[in-house]
């Protein structure tokens, strides 16, 4: 059965300066390949977080993604600014050269409220 990427919240609101959690769960880890978070769609989408060895300021994983059975790929964005507003997608890739996108979550829109 094909892996599904579940983003349960269609939108979240967060006050500037606060942190927010964007939830994402997978129904399977197979086929093997990375999971990445993007803001926006298409060619101009911005990589927000990758569950590899890379480091991303202000963005951390919520659960212990080093668990071999982990299916929770939620992230926390800290010290949110108005520039962080947008729709965030959790995306599953199949390994390859380059990796191939096989499934995306439905997206979670982040609204940033003035403090």
């Amino acid at each position: 059965t094909e892996v599904k990427v579940i983003q349960p919240e269609k939108s979240v609101s967060v006050a500037a300066g606060d942190s927010t959690v964007l939830n994402c769960t997978l129904t399977s880890l197979l086929p093997v390949g990375p999971i990445r978070w993007y803001r926006g769609v298409g060619q101009s989408r911005q990589l927000i977080y990758s569950f590899t060895t890379e480091h991303f300021p202000r963005v951390t994983n919520v659960s212990d993604a080093t668990k071999r059975s982990n299916l929770d790929f939620s992230i926390r964005i800290s010290n949110v600014t108005p520039e962080d507003a947008g729709t965030y997608y959790c995306v599953k890739f199949q390994r390859g050269s380059p990796d191939t996108e096989i499934q995306s979550g439905g997206g979670t829109e982040v609204y940033v409220l003035a403090k």
Partner: antibody, heavy 118, light 107 residues
């Protein structure tokens, strides 16, 4: 620089126990899963056990389940392998290794020799 | 089980390919580990199929397709003599495995 230094090896008798340690430095230890791998004399590499970064999840090869226990102390930047009911077949060099995001290995320790002999 | 040739040999400057078969492309990631003498610390030359650690020379590369992975050494050197172990992680079983090792001799 990433450094992994094993200790605790030595000569023990069959049936005895031993605890190996691995001291980690040069990286954020609490962010990485870790594993133990061994190499018997004249043989190849054999993965034994792995542990998640937080220490809550452990994984073992069938042949050591129930005899070996992997654990870690993140504040001490240390990884452990508790071995019991040792037999001559457990004689090997034991390596600790840091895992990549997909549970392969990117850094290895120098190893510690365990000899089980009567 | 991962299967690789017991030995390969080459002259300096030649290209060496070592294959590793037996994994499932759907569930297995591959790595290659170099061991210059028995009991010495292995060195990772390739992980995640084709990722080369920053301190590994660019003559080492890797690929994977179907049920096999390949380590390629382009312009092999005498100092590349070693045993090369293919390693795999199976996301279905959560288990790591190794091939039996390939002894590379540079003539």
């Amino acid at each position: 620089d990433v450094q992994l230094v094993e200790s605790g090896g030595g000569v023990v008798r069959p049936g005895e126990s031993l605890r190996l340690s691995c001291a980690a430095s040069g990286f954020t230890f609490s962010s990485y899963a870790m594993s133990w791998v061994r190499q018997a004399p004249g043989k190849g590499l054999e993965w034994l056990a792995g542990i998640s970064a937080g220490g809550s999840d452990t994984y073992y090869i069938d042949s050591v389940k129930g005899r070996f226990t992997i654990s870690r102390d993140n504040p001490k930047n240390s990884l452990y392998l508790q071995m019991s009911s040792l037999t001559a077949e457990d004689t090997a060099v034991y390596y600790c290794a840091r895992e990549t995001w997909n549970h392969l290995f990117d850094y290895w320790g120098l190893g510690t020799l365990v000899t089980v002999s009567s | 089980a991962l299967t690789q040739p017991a030995s390969v040999s080459a002259n300096p400057g030649e290209t060496v390919k070592i294959t590793c078969s037996g994994g499932d492309y759907y569930s297995t990631y591959y790595a290659w580990y170099q061991q210059k003498s028995p009991g010495s610390a292995p060195v990772t030359v390739i992980h995640s199929d084709d990722k080369r650690p920053s301190d590994i020379p660019s003559r080492f590369s890797g690929s994977a397709s179907g049920s096999a992975a390949t380590l390629i050494i382009t312009g092999v050197r005498v100092e590349d003599e070693a045993v090369y172990y293919c390693g795999g992680y199976d996301g279905r079983t959560y288990i790591n495995t190794f091939g039996a090792g390939t002894t590379l001799t540079v003539l």
